[in-house]
């Protein structure tokens, strides 16, 4: 079953390579278990950036080596991606799945274009 997912159109990463955005889904029922996946689309290639599952009201659990962190509040997921560089600029798509209880719902956002600008190196202070 399909579900609507909303996310901002554009986000600019900080000078430290950190970008945050909210992924909001219109839950048709009372889900207790949710899976969130962030995918990056660039040059028609799609790659998985990170994925997490969480029980409603609890923290998101990403893998230990994940570049993502996040928190949830109701039907909103606040996602933060770190360690970004200019080459990571692209469309970051939020995918939400309501895993339990049945029925299973799937929603895919339109994507957030994240722009990353590498900071200029500090000039020598001679």
């Amino acid at each position: 079953k399909a579900m609507h997912v909303a996310q901002p159109a554009v986000v600019l990463a900080s000078s430290r390579g950190i970008a945050s955005f909210v992924c909001e889904y219109a839950s048709p029922g009372k889900a207790t278990e949710v899976r969130v996946t962030v995918l990056r689309q660039a040059d028609s290639q799609v790659t998985e950036v990170c994925a997490a599952t969480y029980m409603m009201g609890n923290e998101l659990t990403f893998l230990d080596d994940s570049i993502c962190t996040g928190t949830s509040s109701g039907n909103q997921v606040n996602l933060t991606i770190q360690g970004l560089r200019a080459m990571d600029t692209g469309l970051y798509i939020c995918k939400v799945e309501l895993m339990y209880p049945p029925p299973y719902y799937l929603g895919i956002g339109n994507g957030t274009q994240i722009y990353v600008i590498d900071p200029e190196p500090c000039p020598d202070s001679d």
């Epitope: 399909a2 799609v46 790659t47 994925a51 798509i93 995918k95 895919i108």
Partner: nanobody
């Protein structure tokens, strides 16, 4: 055109085992993910398990965790569901599904295979 064909269903006693297979035909694919869903008569469709190519990462519904194992053979474009310690409540039609990319959703579905667990 991609086709998913399930096999391995049948009737089994409670506590028994079955192994479902789902073979993709119609070309050579690099699916982002393959999964299993089930639907019992008069009930909503339920997610069972899936496996993502990226890291071979698996995910299971709580109701089957520790009893079912999903695996895939990329060379054969086949995904398996090993079901152990079956319970009467596992009785359902089991559907295989595949997604080509993470942002396409479940693009392809099989016709389903019936699993009947008798007590």
């Amino acid at each position: 055109e991609v086709q998913l064909v399930e096999s391995g269903g049948g009737v089994v006693q409670a506590g028994g085992s079955l192994r479902l297979s789902c073979a993709a035909s119609g070309g050579t694919f690099s699916f982002y993910g393959m999964g299993w869903f089930r639907q019992a008569p008069g009930k909503e469709q339920e997610f069972v398990a899936d496996i993502r190519t990226s890291a071979g990462r698996t995910y299971y519904a709580d109701s089957v965790k520790g009893r079912f194992t999903i695996s895939r053979d990329n060379a054969k474009n086949t995904v398996y569901l090993q079901m152990n310690s079956l319970k009467p409540e596992d009785t359902a039609v089991y559907y295989c599904a595949a997604e080509m990319s993470g942002i396409s959703g479940w693009d392809y579905w099989g016709q389903g295979t019936q699993v009947q667990v008798s007590s």
